[in-house]
Amino acid sequence: HSDPARRGELSVCDSISEWVTAADKKTAVDMSGGTVTVLEKVPVSKGQLKQYFYETKCNPMGYTKEGCRGIDKRHWNSQCRTTQSYVRALTMDSKKRIGWRFIRIDTSCVCTLTIKRGR
Amino acid sequence: HSDPARRGELSVCDSISEWVTAADKKTAVDMSGGTVTVLEKVPVSKGQLKQYFYETKCNPMGYTKEGCRGIDKRHWNSQCRTTQSYVRALTMDSKKRIGWRFIRIDTSCVCTLTIKRGR
């Protein structure tokens, strides 16, 4: 996704994005909370595709690993947290049933706040 | 994705998530920046699946439409901004070529900062 820094902006939380193949992902959690195996190849009409996923997570090496950037620290505690979304993937469940299921993948790094008590 | 409010937390930016069908989406932008038509149905081994996408964007009705929550306003201007990610979808390009392409979809609402000048 577009880089805020190019517009002279900073993100409240630093993130890293990468392309991940099913060969590296291996397993995932589906919408019902079950662990499924992510298949390497997707049969398409006239061939096979590698399953790829575009994943974004909080940067563990970033400035914001100790808390979010730009927060009013007098009133708030903050934390950068990886959030997930759902994408459809060809998977196999624990009963060896192959099918298209929505799995959770990391898609963003957002800032969450808790109010400071007892100031 | 998990709701921070359940843990007594607030998001710096308010977001809304929804399931969107290809019938509603109609078109999208692919990785090369071209506009493609998103096909309603995907042929699978035993029939057809409706193409669905899980999309998250900034809540236009939310508290944070004027700026991000919890920001140190003495030093920063802030804005909640919808970010995008890539998912694979069955699409048709302008030359009527049908194929699996990575398209951009809304996946998050994050806060971006610009430093306040001339205080």
Partner: antibody
Framework: DVQLVESGGGVVRPGESLRLSCAAS????????MNWVRQAPGEGLEWVSG????????YYADSVKGRFTISRDNSKNTLYLQINSLRAEDTAIYYC????????????WGLGTLVTVSS | EIVLTQSPGTLTVSPGDRATLSCRAS??????LAWYQQKPGQAPRLLIY???SRATGIPDRFSGSESGTDFTLTINGLAPEDFAVYYC??????????FGGGTKVEIK
């Protein structure tokens, strides 16, 4: 600019071993599956081996299975090919090639390193 | 394993003319075909992917098309730098990824 630089080639006797390296720069190395393709003198191109971005998946041509081992060190942005039990028919220029995310074709190639197997 | 057969083995053309190169697959591969150019002493360079999509920076005189299992690379108005060997590659069924034997385009 994307750059792939192979090294480690040389003249060896049948039955001996060699380790080829490919130093990558100018792109996010772990985002891409990588491959080795070889070309015997005056001949066409032959795909040899491939590896997924994080190394979880490895793939080999039948002609090299059991003798060749592909690996990568993402911290060093380097791809490797360990070649054992060399045969005369392994004599070739070995190219390191970056796989596109859009499909299993090669969008960038190194200049190659020559392996000569001769008694 | 999918076999790709390229023809002709050598194509002799005058600069400015059109060159038509053929690649036939032994079975259906959809549009999962790429074309590469290789000059003597150099690495191959990607020209076309998905049978008809031009790679970044490739001049529009290069075009690809498909008809069933027959694929064509057309070079309109051959420039001096276009004289080289051209290879097709399938990525429909893998592994293995397979290449055609190549077509050499030489100056008439």
């Amino acid at each position: 600019d994307v750059q792939l630089v192979e090294s480690g080639g040389g003249v060896v006797r049948p039955g001996e071993s060699l380790r080829l390296s490919c130093a990558a720069s100018g792109f996010t190395f772990n985002n891409h599956d990588m491959n080795w393709v070889r070309q015997a003198p005056g001949e066409g191109l032959e795909w040899v081996s491939g590896i997924s971005g994080r190394g979880g998946g490895t793939y080999y041509a039948d002609s090299v299975k059991g003798r060749f081992t592909i690996s990568r060190d993402n911290s060093k942005n380097t791809l490797y090919l360990q070649i054992n039990s060399l045969r005369a028919e392994d004599t070739a220029i070995y190219y390191c090639a970056r796989e596109s995310i859009w499909g299993i074709f090669f969008d960038y190639w190194g200049l190659g390193t020559l392996v000569t197997v001769s008694s | 394993e999918i076999v790709l057969t390229q023809s002709p083995g050598t194509l002799t053309v005058s600069p400015g003319d059109r060159a038509t190169l053929s690649c036939r697959a032994s079975q259906t591969i959809g549009s999962y075909l790429a074309w590469y150019q290789q000059k003597p002493g150099q690495a191959p360079r990607l020209l076309i992917y998905d049978a008809s999509s031009r790679a970044t920076g490739i001049p529009d005189r290069f075009s690809g098309s498909e008809s069933g299992t027959d694929f064509t690379l057309t070079i309109n108005g051959l420039a001096p730098e276009d004289f080289a060997v051209y290879y097709c590659q399938q990525y429909s069924n893998w592994p293995p990824l397979t290449f055609g034997g190549g077509t050499k385009v030489e100056i008439k």
